[in-house]
């Protein structure tokens, strides 16, 4: 899997989990989430060689088309795969509100 | 949604689904399928700037992000989001067989 | 060049099962038809089935039905034969071979072959 | 499943002798389902005719094949001595796949 464990240990051009810091305030003006000040989103980055952690049949067959075909510009793409959630603190006036976001961290990556 | 109803009748450079048209003998160098010789794949391309059509709250998070840290290599990709099968025709020695292969056809895009 | 390269001998004891594998390299695996024949003294050659890459599409001679599993890793380039249930019978030379292009066909390049013997 | 049956089972020829080794098909194949192989002791089986009658890249010319329906034939023009080894023909016509029981030819 293309998670942390593979992905931090190994430097890897191909596609892969990359570390990303995001600060709420700073990166994304959002001055509203009171804890925690940022986290850990990751993200997907890297080239998507033949068969190279394809998702799908469409991807694996994208893959065998741009090996054939080297000068086509149709090629799978490094997206995320498994996401979780984040729990944040904010504050509605004075009362503390806990809320779970969606979706907010890449934990694995494949080519799609 | 950005399918070919909206994608073949625009110009557009964001993320959108593309036509590709795939010969198997040519363009794959599968010999065994006999019907069809080919068939639209297609592909997903172009950009993702913010929020066009984001997928998750990861990618609209990145999107954000990528707004705000032009520099950042962090950024959504595009990619498929519905697929269809294709029905095929082989042979095994002179017995005709019909096969339903799963997720072959690209229908529409989204930016994750 | 277009190379196979299998698994080495193995010995199985009876009801036991084996899986081989078949390293493609030199060509495009996933263009190709993978088959998978046996050989021994006594029956000569024997057809067990083919497996195509990319779409999984597996087919199988109707005797080994039901015990024999044919796979396709695309991303190692590698097939495997995994045989169930064996027999003192099924002791024989494997060889994991790429057809022409279709899915019954003729075979053009073959594995080294993996000797697997059957035996209490 | 079809029977491949391979005549004679054993040959000794001569260098530069023309040999001639049959393939009968229990049922008709038509005209392209047929194979021919070559292997020698403790080695792979080679290919060298596919199709009745199309040579594997690589193979000498003194091999040919020919034949349609249930009769298929593999002739060796002018024999060599590398030529010593065990011929198998092979239907692909019909699952499953199967060969003919060999012929092995000795070089005199």
């Known amino acids: 899997a293309l998670d942390a464990a593979y992905c931090f240990r190994n430097v890897q051009d191909n596609c892969c989990l990359r570390p990303l810091y995001i600060d709420f305030k700073r990166d994304l003006g959002w001055k509203w989430i009171h804890e925690p000040k940022g986290y850990n989103a990751n993200f997907c980055a890297g080239a998507c060689p033949y068969l190279w952690s394809s998702d799908t049949q469409h991807s694996r067959v994208l893959s065998l088309y741009n090996t054939i075909n080297p000068e086509a510009s149709a090629s799978p793409c490094c997206v995320s795969q498994d996401l979780e959630p984040l729990t944040i603190l904010y504050y509605i006036g004075k009362t503390p509100k806990i809320e779970q976001l969606s979706n907010m961290i890449v934990k694995s990556c494949k080519c799609s | 949604a950005l399918d070919a109803a909206y994608c073949f009748r625009n110009v557009q450079d964001n993320c959108c689904l593309r036509p590709l048209y795939i010969d198997f003998k040519r363009d794959l160098g599968w010999k065994w399928i006999h019907e069809p010789k080919g068939y639209n794949a297609n592909f997903c391309a172009g950009a993702c700037p913010y929020l066009w059509s984001s997928d998750t709250q990861h990618s609209r998070v990145l999107s954000l992000y990528n707004t705000i840290n032009p520099e950042a290599s962090a950024s959504p990709c595009c990619v498929s989001q519905d697929l269809e099968p294709l029905t095929i025709l082989y042979y095994i020695g002179k017995t005709p067989k019909i096969e339903q292969l799963s997720n072959m056809i690209v229908k529409s895009c989204k930016c994750s | 060049q277009v190379l196979l390269v299998q698994s080495g001998a193995d010995v199985r004891k009876p009801g036991a099962s084996v899986k081989i594998f078949c390293k493609a390299s030199?060509?495009?695996?996933?263009?190709?038809?993978i088959s998978w024949v046996r050989q021994t003294p006594a029956q000569g050659f024997e057809w067990m089935g083919g497996v195509i890459p990319i779409v999984d599409i597996a087919n199988y001679a109707q005797r080994f039905k039901g015990r024999l599993v044919l796979t396709a890793d695309t991303s190692t380039n590698t097939a495997y034969m995994e045989l169930r249930s064996l027999k003192s019978a099924d002791t024989a030379v494997y060889y994991c071979a790429s057809t022409l292009g279709l899915v019954l066909d003729a075979m053009d390049y073959w594995g080294q072959g993996s000797l697997v013997t059957v035996s209490s | 499943e079809i029977q491949m049956t391979q005549s004679p089972s054993s040959l000794s020829a001569s260098p530069g002798d023309r040999v001639t080794i049959t393939c009968r098909a229990s049922q008709s194949l038509g005209s392209s389902y047929l194979a021919w192989y070559q292997q020698k002791p403790g080695k792979v089986p080679k290919l060298l005719i596919y199709?009745?009658?199309s040579r594997a890249p690589g193979v000498p010319s003194r091999f040919s094949g020919s034949g349609s329906g249930t009769d298929f034939t593999l002739t060796i023009s002018s024999l060599e001595p590398e030529d010593a080894a065990t011929y198998y023909c092979q239907q692909y016509a019909d699952s499953p796949i199967t060969f003919g029981q060999g012929t092995k030819l000795e070089i005199k």
């Open positions: 199709g009745a009658s």
């Open positions: 030199g060509y495009t695996f996933t263009s190709n038809v």
